[in-house]
């Protein structure tokens, strides 16, 4: 069975075809939800509105964007906030209400045709029984704007580390790739002895942060080779 591969609590070496799977004890806990589950048509109304935790703008409704609720607040805790109307301050397109975009830090109308290449499309995530109806969870995303591209927050799906915000790297999680925190001093890291020698890592860790390297923990030198614990340590 694949139990040992997907058991996140252990680091195990497995026979082919899957190779070894690294556990993931060194990662920080994501503040925003990593999973969204669709409800059906019947569940599109909200009885009592609650702040909805998010990791990126596309997890919020059409009239919302994802940000920390307090200015300069903990960047780890983000919720869906009401979009900003015309002439309000902004930092990216998604902050502005539909029909507007962020230009020079201000939400302006996107009616002008010259903006077409950069305009945001409204994506409706349809979770009911008819994908052709706009009955679902609306999400906005910037199509081609390099200037206003928002980097992925922790838990966001990514293709490469440059897709992730500062302090995060793009690493494997289950069968996908998400932005995870770069490892801090003292956190467990994965040391690959030879390039290509490691097997499949279902839960990949990020690399150690700046000024740190992945080395055997000093008090683990006596342990057997296989159980040596590596941590991020100062050079």
């Amino acid at each position: 069975t694949l139990n040992s591969v997907l058991n996140s609590n252990a680091i195990k070496n497995l026979p082919p075809p899957l190779g070894g799977a690294a556990g993931h004890p060194g990662s920080a806990v994501s503040a925003a939800p990593g999973i969204l589950y669709p409800g059906g048509n019947k569940y599109q109304t909200i009885d009592n509105y609650q702040p909805y935790p998010c990791a990126e703008d596309e997890e919020c409704g059409t009239d919302e964007y994802c940000a920390s609720p307090t200015r300069g607040g903990d960047a780890g805790v983000q919720i869906c906030l009401a979009c900003r109307k015309r002439r309000k301050r902004c930092m990216r397109h998604a902050m502005c209400c539909p029909g507007n975009y962020c230009k020079n830090g201000i939400c302006v109308s996107s009616d002008q045709n010259h903006f077409r290449g950069e305009i945001e499309e409204t994506i409706t995530e349809s979770f009911g029984n008819d994908h052709s109806t706009l009955d679902g969870y609306s999400r906005r995303t910037t199509l081609s704007s390099k200037m206003y591209h928002t980097k992925g927050q922790e838990g966001s799906v990514c293709l490469r580390s440059s897709d992730c915000a500062s302090g995060l790297c793009c690493a494997r999680h289950f069968w996908s790739k998400i932005c995870k925190p770069v490892l801090k001093e003292g956190q467990v890291c994965t040391k690959h002895r030879r390039k290509g020698s490691h097997g499949l890592e279902i839960f990949q860790r990020c690399y150690c942060g700046e000024g740190l390297s992945c080395r055997i923990q000093k008090d683990h030198h006596q342990a057997s080779n296989s159980s040596r614990l590596h941590t991020c340590q100062r050079h």
Partner: antibody
Framework: QVQLVESGGGVVQPGRSLRLSCAAS????????MHWVRQAPGKGLEWVAV????????YYADSVKGRFTISRDNAKNTLYLQMNSLRAEDTAVYYC???????WGQGTLVTVSS | DIVMTQTPLSLSVTPGQPASISCKSG???????????LYWYLQKPGQPPQFLIY???NRFSRVPDRFSGSGSGTDFTLRISRVEAEDVGIYYC?????????FGQGTQVEIK
């Protein structure tokens, strides 16, 4: 529109083959692991197969191992399930599913009958 | 495989009354990333799954707040505070911490 749309289902004789497709749109398909899950008439869901974001790693339920092959074309944002040596017990609605921020398609019915 | 056991298998509820469904997993669903990969979904005849709860207790943003999830480790509960006619169907729990994804047997909820 963020969605998954399955196609390719139909009626097929035992021992024959069928290829299902799942067209993804509205999200970064190439970053997500993708799964196939099926549901036999009147029964619960059964996980069938998974493929990693890059297509390099695949895993199958014991019931389909050696007969089914999962694959993906990230350039076309499409997931596939090649089903060979079909049996009556493979009759089910087949759903493709995105992991993490889970999203399911509407399903496509495969009926294996002589 | 992780066995998911649901109780009861059927439930008949008066509209406006509460309902509670239990789900037990054969092993802990707590991942080292701090998340517990347990979900609840509702299925109606001829329809795909409608997911209600993710990671034990998080409601999908458009799901009414009469639905709530709780639990940890291996014991989980889905509660509907006031059942409505539209809530009928089969409720399933599901885990995805480990392959294969596995599902509870389902709890049929009907209105009295």
């Amino acid at each position: 529109q963020v969605q998954l749309v399955e196609s390719g289902g139909g009626v097929v004789q035992p021992g024959r083959s069928l290829r299902l497709s799942c067209a993804a749109s509205g999200f970064t398909f190439s970053g997500y692991g993708m799964h196939w899950v099926r549901q036999a008439p009147g029964k619960g869901l059964e996980w069938v197969a998974v493929i990693s974001y890059d297509g390099n790693d695949k895993y199958y339920a014991d019931s389909v191992k050696g007969r089914f092959t999962i694959s993906r074309d990230n350039a076309k944002n499409t997931l596939y399930l090649q089903m060979n040596s079909l049996r009556a017990e493979d009759t089910a609605v087949y759903y493709c599913a995105r992991e993490l921020r889970v999203l399911w398609g509407q399903g496509t019915l495969v009926t294996v009958s002589s | 495989d992780i066995v998911m056991t649901q109780t009861p298998l059927s439930l008949s509820v008066t509209p406006g009354q509460p309902a509670s469904i239990s789900c037990k997993s054969g092993q802990s669903l707590l991942h080292s990333d701090g998340k517990t990969y347990l979900y609840w979904y509702l299925q109606k005849p001829g329809q795909p799954p409608q997911f209600l709860i993710y990671e034990v207790s998080n409601r999908f943003s458009r799901v009414p707040d009469r639905f709530s999830g709780s639990g940890s480790g291996t014991d989980f509960t889905l509660r509907i505070s006031r059942v409505e006619a539209e809530d009928v169907g089969i409720y399933y729990c599901m885990q995805s911490i480990q392959l294969p994804w596995t599902f509870g047997q389902g709890t049929q909820v009907e209105i009295k």
